[in-house]
């Protein structure tokens, strides 16, 4: 039977018909009482007082309604949930993940996790309705958890007509003994001791450091990982692990040469709710490597949307060479990460100026051969984009990656819905296409346009009647990603390059073949 439920857009929590709840109003001390009525939340302000007993974790402020028994927690930054029990900054799980309270919500198959409070899970052994739900990390959310001491976090997903448990693709904090760091590396306890310039770190207990805050003498030294060693650490919440060094007999500090543990290609995919011509409206969290590139034009004021881009490392964006034919000065370009709506700032978006960009020397503006460009983001440190649920790198493919013909992949972008539309999409879209065999990616299949070995084709293979809504890239999507699942991670296979019209039956879109440019990419990203 179909159930009417409400989804609170602010908290992503779900509620049954006629259920009520309290919610804090962001950036104010007000509290709203909400009621689920025919699938719509109706909310109004209510008076509150401080709670008579503490009910919020992680420093949350508890307030209870004046005239009934419900309570609400105002959570400090970095925490969420009914009782502030969710750690929104946890980027990985330790050991088996029993204590994991992060926000990863994607199963290994790529399926979206089901909300633990969903009535469909009422008969399951683990749900948000259990009396010990809070202790187990379960509640009104769909985040991966390990309540039964399994080997790693898991969740329920709906597949083959039923709800079954599946392990999550949540990153583990220590993958074997690989010496790398997650997030900003504040939990890094590895043994790297060289800086980015190749200098050796000073021991944290060195006499030279007397008077410095972060040394082995710090009262919290043990908790911060400081001691009688010279290993890189991040005791002060900086961008990444660092250490003290002597440079030309002067005491200073430098970021370390510690690789970050790759979380590339992992994402929290949510099933698109709305079909639109040429694809589906999507959330940026489903495509966190998608960048939007804007350009100032000499002739017109303000910035206008230029092209898509792809985040491949903290400071580098991959895009299409043809986007830069106007030879913009780098300072006329802006890159925005973490944005769902093309021209509406996102709450967690990150905005960057461009240091420089590199267009492939052999780009051919007639055939679009070698249609690839790299943009370096401007930053004061060696880090630019900070990883979050809406900003993350895509994986570059291994050089020998060969996916089977007709593999289903996806592209994303803010481009037009159809070729004749005068406007770009107001919201990010995704499209599902299949990789064409090279025998079907030739000049004769594309009106005698030149097709080179540096290109690949992908398109929607569904049978298209006159009303068919075939998925495809379109104008404005250029420079954006064509990604395919490989080894459990979304891997960049193509860069949106060109096509004949948009969404035409049996006419694939054409993409720059990324495996042909791995050495070029690496070469140009060198420090």
């Amino acid at each position: 039977s179909y159930q009417v439920i409400c989804r609170d857009e602010k908290t992503q929590m779900i509620y049954q018909q006629h259920q009520s709840w309290l919610r804090p109003v962001l950036r104010s001390n007000r509290v709203e009482y909400c009621w689920c009525n025919s699938g719509r939340a109706q909310c109004h302000s209510v008076p509150v007082k401080s709670c008579s007993e503490p009910r919020c974790f992680n420093g949350g402020t508890c307030q209870q309604a004046l005239y009934f028994s419900d309570f609400v927690c105002q959570c400090p930054e970095g925490f969420a949930g009914k009782c502030c029990e969710i750690d929104t900054r946890a980027t990985c799980y330790e050991d088996q993940g029993i204590s994991y309270r992060g926000t990863w919500s994607t199963a290994e198959s790529g399926a979206e996790c089901t909300n633990w409070n969903s009535s469909a899970l009422a008969q399951k052994p683990y749900s948000g309705r259990r009396p010990d739900a809070i202790r187990l990390g379960l509640g009104n959310h769909n985040y991966c958890r390990n309540p039964d001491r399994d080997s790693k976090p898991w969740c329920y997903v709906f597949k083959a007509g039923k709800y079954s448990s599946e392990f999550c693709s949540t990153p583990a904090c220590s993958e074997g003994n690989s010496d790398c760091y997650f997030g900003n590396g504040s939990a890094y306890r590895g043994t790297h001791s060289l800086t980015e310039s190749g200098a050796s770190c000073l021991p944290w207990n060195s006499m030279i450091l007397i008077g410095k805050v972060y040394t082995a003498q710090n009262p919290s030294a043990q908790a911060l990982g400081l001691g009688k060693h010279n290993y890189c650490r991040n005791p002060d919440g900086d961008a990444k692990p660092w250490c003290h060094v002597l440079k030309n007999r002067r005491l200073t500090w430098e970021y370390c040469d510690v690789p970050s543990c790759s979380t590339c290609g992992l994402r929290q995919y949510s099933q698109p709710q709305f079909r639109i011509k040429g694809g589906l409206f999507a959330d940026i969290a489903s495509h966190p490597w998608q960048a939007a590139i804007f350009a100032k034009h000499r002739r017109s004021p303000g910035e206008r949307f230029l092209c898509g881009g792809i985040l491949i490392s903290s400071c580098w964006i991959l895009s299409a060479a043809h986007c830069f034919q106007e030879r913009f000065p780098p300072h006329h370009l802006t890159v925005i990460l973490g944005r769902t709506y093309r021209v509406v700032p996102g709450e967690e978006e990150q905005k960057f100026e461009v240091e420089k960009y590199i267009v492939h020397k052999e780009f051919d503006d007639d055939t679009y051969d070698n249609d690839i460009a790299l943009l370096q983001l401007k930053s004061d440190s060696s880090r630019c984009a900070q990883e979050s649920s809406v900003v993350r790198t895509v994986c570059l493919p291994p050089a020998d990656l060969q996916l089977p013909d007709w593999t289903e992949c996806e592209l994303s972008g803010y481009g037009k819905h159809e070729a004749l539309s005068p406007f770009y999409s107001e919201r990010l879209k995704e499209a599902h296409v299949r990789l064409y065999p090279s025998s079907r990616c030739t000049s004769q299949h594309l009106l005698n346009r030149t097709v080179t070995d540096n290109m690949l084709c992908a398109g929607d293979t569904r049978s298209g009647g006159p009303q068919a809504n075939l998925h495809d890239a379109c104008q404005g999507d250029s420079g954006g990603p064509l990604v395919c699942l490989n080894d459990g991670r979304m891997t960049l296979v193509g860069i949106i390059s060109w096509g004949l019209g948009c969404g035409q039956k049996d006419v694939p879109g054409v993409y720059t073949k990324v495996t042909n440019y791995l050495d070029w990419i690496r070469d140009n990203m060198r420090p």
């Epitope: 010496d179 790297h192 060289l194 310039s197 190749g198 040469d257 510690v258 690789p259 420089k356 590199i358 020397k361 790299l374 370096q376 570059l396 493919p397 291994p398 050089a399 020998d400 495996t515 791995l518 050495d519 690496r522 070469d523 140009n524 990203m525 060198r526 420090p527």
Partner: antibody
Framework: QVQLVQSGAEVKKPGASVKVSCKAS??????INWVRQATGQGLEWMGR????????GYAQKFQGRVTLTRDTSISTAYMELSSLRSEDTAVYYC?????????WGQGTLVTVSS | DVVMTQSPLSLPVTPGEPASISCRSS???????????LDWYLQKPGQSPQLLIY???NRASGVPDRFSGSGSGTDFTLKISRVEAEDVGVYYC?????????FGGGTKVEIK
């Protein structure tokens, strides 16, 4: 600290192939380059491999004769040179590249002799 | 290919005196990303080469400050302000901007 340890010396007949290994410890995400040096001669760059993705770049002179591969599970890079000739007798070095070739292996002497 | 030409071929030096080695490239070695990948390596007798200077003028970790690098475009110089006995060996310039990467022919520094 990156450390590179190469396999031992080899003696090969003309026309044969040789495969030299280079095991890395420390930060193993940097390019591994291969450089050779004939006795009493200078240094000659042969090619490079990205240990992560496996992408390669070769000097034209060796294209088709040299193959660079890697096994990420054991942090080891390999250089295979085929159709050996007497002039391939040299010490072969692997070197790890980040901002430059800052770390070098100890070298592997390959002798080609009938 | 970019040809790197070093001079002199051989450089007899007196300890405590300065020394200078020149390196000229057959074309500009500014990379498309804007960097100039011109390095200097020293190979001491019986040893693997070691990095001295990277990207024209940056001293590698642990390299004494008597070594300095300079230059731009196609002309580059390595200077040793006061030569010490341990500085003997063959010095190579190297360009890593254009594939194939290439080394200079080497300059042999020996004590007089």
């Amino acid at each position: 600290q990156v450390q590179l340890v190469q396999s031992g010396a080899e003696v090969k007949k003309p026309g044969a192939s040789v495969k030299v290994s280079c095991k890395a410890s420390g930060n193993t995400s940097y390019w591994i380059n291969w450089v050779r040096q004939a006795t009493g001669q200078g240094l000659e760059w042969m090619g490079r491999i990205d240990p992560g993705g496996g992408s390669t770049g070769y000097a034209q002179k060796f294209q088709g004769r040299v193959t660079l591969t890697r096994d990420t599970s054991i942090s080891t890079a390999y250089m295979e040179l085929s159709s050996l000739r007497s002039e391939d007798t040299a010490v072969y070095y692997c070197a790890s590249y980040y901002y430059a070739m800052a770390y070098w292996g100890q070298g592997t002497l390959v002798t080609v002799s009938s | 290919d970019v040809v790197m030409t070093q001079s002199p071929l051989s450089l007899p030096v007196t300890p405590g005196e300065p020394a200078s080695i020149s390196c000229r490239s057959s074309q500009s070695i500014v990379h498309s990303n804007g960097n100039t990948y011109l390095d200097w390596y020293l190979q001491k007798p019986g040893q693997s080469p070691q990095l001295l200077i990277y990207k024209v003028s940056n001293r590698a970790s642990g390299v004494p400050d008597r070594f300095s690098g300079s230059g731009s475009g196609t002309d580059f110089t390595l200077k040793i302000s006061r030569v010490e006995a341990e500085d003997v060996g063959v010095y190579y310039c190297f360009q890593g901007s254009h594939v194939p990467w290439t080394f200079g022919g080497g300059t042999k520094v020996e004590i007089k």
